[in-house]
Amino acid sequence: SEVEYRAEVGQNAYLPCFYTPAAPGNLVPVCWGKGACPVFECGNVVLRTDERDVNYWTSRYWLNGDFRKGDVSLTIENVTLADSGIYCCRIQIPGIMNDEKFNLKLVIKPAKVTPAPTRQRDFTAAFPRMLTTRGHGPAETQTLGSLPDINLTQISTLANELRDSRLANDLRDSGATIRIG
């Protein structure tokens, strides 16, 4: 499975991934990694849960949803162009080769700057030498990475508001979802 999500530099990105626990509290280990899903595990792990809790995370990466109910969607805080790429959400279902894995594409748009002093843009991996040339500065609210065909401005609510909104259901329907049990 492969879907693309977008966010703007300086904002928070949201990568949806869900499963349905067989029973309340009967959790399945999950890992998030940078780069496409390998055969086993996650490469370049940024966050991991076990049967009870989040047991490993790195700065800027967190689960904002209720992971105990199977919402293991990843939020990446204050993104840069270097966060562009493929992210692997792996639901580590017990048994041989039972894992469900999802490759999600995250595209980061450069923050726009007004006025435009030059026509040349240096789209680095934002590694340090990023130059952008137009538009407005980063939004004051933290815009979440959008689904395809959903405008960023349409979903500029804070990440924790998203969980209770109707959009959460839309994300659940079009994001990575797996039912267990």
Partner: antibody
Amino acid sequence: QVQLQQSGPQLVRPGSSVQISCKTSGYSFTSYLMHWVRQRPGQGLEWIGSIDPSDSEISLNQKFMDKATLTVDKSSSTANMQFSSPTSEDSAVYFCARDFGYVAWFVYWGQGTLVTVSA
Amino acid sequence: DIVMTQSHKFMSTSIEDRVSITCKASQDVSAAVAWYQQKPGQTPKLLIYSTFYRYIGVPDRFTGSGSGTDFTFTITSVQAEDLAVYFCQQHYSVPWTFGGGTKLEIK
């Protein structure tokens, strides 16, 4: 699925001009930069430049500043490159390539257009 | 312009061997290096971006490492279908530049 379909091979005279088209499908044309890359026989890859189809903003390799003209036709989701005053040194396969999105690694490539410059 | 140098034009290997291809940048490019595979008569295929990260559909045997100016692309167990030319590319600053390529051959 994403497809980039380039125009056919061309035999051109030195000093004339050559136009190559790259018709795209399977994605939102204005959401990604389109790049042009060339490969001379038995050689490496050389980035010519890129164009943002949303506003036709162009970034060109200085080496090709006076040679390459990049345009887009949004109505047909097509990118074009015109190459002026070619010499035998410009005989190469020319590729259009779509980037990942605001970062310059090239995920999708056209099949290439062979340009032969010969008198 | 940043010059990307692949010192070996050719490398010989045997099936199931481990092989590493190196690429040197003329200045610091942080971790902004991609690797491509090109088979005869085909277009380049993105394998690795930002030094370490495999693109979708790329087998686990392909890995990348390095930082700054020195980068390495490794195939941990070469398969027959891996015989191709491999290019590095910096995506740190324009103009984006490629290495000259390393052709992987069977001994």
